[in-house]
């Protein structure tokens, strides 16, 4: 069976949108009006992994690009990157673990925990125009809560 996907945008709990910053980086900043068209549209795929009532495993690709968010060790630290893949083979139901995020739904907010690195989350900074990154703390200064907006195909 083909993997199921839907198109969406994400905003952090401070309403910052995610945009491309160079070919392999995302940054978070406040957008308004026509600038909203700059925000990244994700193709969220529902993949194989540990699932519970609050937790659904997903992969986050950039719509119509062969780029996926992935989690790897760099200098011994879990790091978020945009990784290029062969579009003939992706997305697939059984994604490699580095591409898998546990989408956790709590009080109408979403967290995206790395399946590869438990307790590390897609994060944004309080500051404007800073890179989206993988953070190892929740409830601190950095933002780990998001909302999802569905986008028609």
């Amino acid at each position: 069976a083909p993997v199921r996907s839907l198109n969406c945008t994400l905003r952090d709990s401070q309403q910052k949108s995610l945009v491309m910053s160079g070919p392999y980086e995302l940054k978070a900043l406040h957008l308004q009006g026509q600038d909203m068209e700059q925000q990244v549209v994700f193709s969220m795929s529902f993949v194989q992994g540990e699932e519970s009532n609050d937790k659904i495993p997903v992969a986050l690709g950039l719509k119509e690009k062969n780029l996926y968010l992935s989690c790897v060790l760099k200098d011994d630290k879990p790091t978020l990157q945009l990784e290029s893949v062969d579009p003939k083979n992706y997305p697939k139901k059984k994604m490699e673990k580095r591409f898998v995020f546990n989408k956790i739904e709590i009080n109408n907010k979403l967290e995206f925990e790395s399946a590869q690195f438990p307790n590390w989350y897609i994060s944004t900074s309080q500051a404007e125009n800073m890179p989206v990154f993988l953070g190892g703390t929740k409830g601190g200064q950095d933002i780990t809560d998001f909302t999802m907006q569905f986008v028609s195909s």
Partner: nanobody, 123 residues
Framework: EVQLLESGGGLVQPGGSLRLSCAAS????????MGWVRQAPGKGLEWVSS????????YYADSVKGRFTISRDDSKNTLYLQMNSLRAEDTAVYYC????????????????WGQGTLVTVSS
């Protein structure tokens, strides 16, 4: 043409049991995640349970966990839902859904669903 035909519903007393079946045809059953959703009178659709292709993973809504068991027999192209310790709040039309994927707590995607079978729990 995809067809899903549910059966096994009926009237049962609180604490009783029922086993629902869903006979599938028109697609390669074993390749697809399947599941059950239900609609109580005057309410919206509620996800109940899912089972992965090959049947090695099962998922349940909190409201039915420990009471309902989903299973499948790929040789018979049939999906099952064993419902035990039934409660009045389980009264609903139960639908079998093909390629059911849970997007969030309150949102699902599926390609096809059946006509449904009515389960009434009442004394």
């Amino acid at each position: 043409e995809v067809q899903l035909l549910e059966s096994g519903g009926g009237l049962v007393q609180p604490g009783g049991s029922l086993r629902l079946s869903c006979a599938a045809s028109g697609f390669t059953f074993e390749d697809y995640q399947m599941g059950w959703v239900r609609q109580a009178p005057g309410k919206g659709l509620e996800w109940v349970s899912s089972i992965s292709a090959m049947g090695n993973r099962t998922y349940y809504a909190d409201s039915v966990k420990g009471r309902f068991t989903i299973s499948r027999d790929d040789s018979k192209n049939t999906l099952y839902l064993q419902m035990n310790s039934l409660r009045a709040e389980d009264t609903a039309v139960y639908y079998c859904a093909e390629n059911l994927v849970r997007v969030s707590k309150a949102r699902w995607m599926f390609d096809y669903w059946g006509q449904g079978t009515l389960v009434t729990v009442s004394s």
